[in-house]
């Protein structure tokens, strides 16, 4: 049953809370099985997804799994939005689901959480088994 | 050989908890793109999706039924558990574990045999 | 939610004959990344569901190429070539674009 079709993971709705000022990875997990696509990363701006074409990116690979990450370095807050990475395969567009940056901005500490909204809220602790950042589901 | 099974309790009392655990073999769920999630069927009624849980711990509810339910997965033992609090006797069912496979996006592509839930004091 | 219509909701069918189920969706199920998730299941007496058709027209591993599936957008059609007796069950289209993820109410096919 294994295909060898490209597939990128990234899941509908997902989310990621973010600090403005601290550094971020983006990952686009991609499987595929002999030659690399070509995967790029876009904002989605309405209906249009715009690509990032001068923004840092980078390959991680793991044996089963590649990871084609879009840096912030640092995040910025208008960096706040949903993003989405498409791979070219043979010819084929491969496109992700998008997912959503929220950017809290530091200079707003009111806006970040309260303890008691992390306790009603644990998934904001989630940390993401590849990086040290939060994951808000 | 992929399989899922269901285990839990048969009879159930209005008010009580359901513990149901979904117990599966030939793949893993730290797999990316793989999930699991618990469907039910009540007696000669259409199927009802209920939650799924993802490879990297993430978790989808029905929202008609999200504050009675939470699932849990543990990847060492292969099993996925849900648990729905406050049963009534419409909540009787055939409750089933579906594996989600992955083309974009999640699809049900194995299924368990199924364990009928009976709500009744 | 999304809610997913079949019809017949009954359809004796004689062996050998085709075969044809309509499911229809209230939303477009045609997702942002450009692909449809609408995937039909067949549930034999007494069986659990079994997987037939994903992203609309794609043959689950296993499953008979008498087996079908097409449409785009809202409107969904299952069809069986030449209906043979293990074929009789009920069938269900589920829809995976949106949240929650729904089933149709399930298409019982009958021999003549």
């Known amino acids: 049953k294994e295909s060898c079709d490209v597939q990128l993971y990234i899941k509908r709705q997902s989310e990621h809370s973010i600090l403005a000022g601290d550094p971020f990875e983006l990952e686009c997990p991609v499987k595929y099985c002999a030659n690399r696509p070509h995967v790029t990363w876009c904002k989605l701006n309405g209906t249009t997804c715009v690509k990032l074409e001068d923004r840092q990116t980078s390959w991680k690979e793991e044996k089963n799994i590649s990871f084609f990450i879009l840096h912030f370095e640092p995040v910025l807050p208008n960096d706040n939005g949903s993003y989405r990475c498409s791979a070219n395969f043979q010819s084929n567009l491969i496109e992700s689901h998008s997912t959503t940056l929220y950017v809290t901005d530091v200079k707003s500490a009111s806006e970040r959480p309260s303890k008691d909204e992390m306790a009603s809220r644990p998934w904001l602790l989630y940390r993401h088994h590849h990086h040290h950042h939060h994951h808000h589901h | 050989q992929i399989t899922l099974k269901e285990s839990g309790p048969t009879l159930v009392k209005p008010t009580q908890t359901l513990t149901l655990t979904c117990t599966f073999s030939?793949?893993?769920?730290?797999?990316?793109?793989?999930?699991v999630s618990w469907i039910r069927q009540p007696p000669g009624k259409a199927l009802e999706w209920l939650a799924h849980i993802y490879w990297d711990d993430d978790k989808r509810f029905n929202p008609s039924l999200k504050s009675r339910l939470t699932i849990t997965k543990d990847t060492s033992k292969n099993q996925v558990v849900l648990t729905m609090t406050n049963m009534d006797p419409v909540d009787t069912a055939t409750y089933y574990c579906?594996?989600?496979?992955?083309?974009?996006?999640?699809?049900?592509?194995?299924w368990g045999q199924g364990t009928l839930v009976t709500v009744s004091s | 939610d999304v809610v997913m219509t079949q019809s017949p909701l009954s359809l004796p069918v004689t062996l050998g004959q085709p075969a044809s189920i309509s499911c229809k969706s209230t939303q477009s199920l045609l997702d942002s990344d450009g692909k449809t998730y609408l995937n039909w299941f067949q549930q034999r007496p007494g069986q659990s569901p079994r997987s037939l058709i994903y992203?609309?027209?794609k043959l689950d591993s296993g499953v008979p190429d008498r087996f079908s599936g097409s449409g785009s957008g809202t409107d969904f059609t299952l069809k069986i070539s030449r209906v043979e007796a293990e074929d009789v069950g009920v069938y269900y289209c589920w829809q995976g674009t949106h949240f929650p993820w729904t089933f149709g109410q399930g298409t019982k096919v009958e021999i003549k």
């Open positions: 030939g793949f893993s769920l730290s797999t990316f793109g793989m999930g």
């Open positions: 579906a594996r989600g496979n992955w083309d974009g996006e999640t699809y049900f592509d194995y």
């Open positions: 992203l609309v027209s």
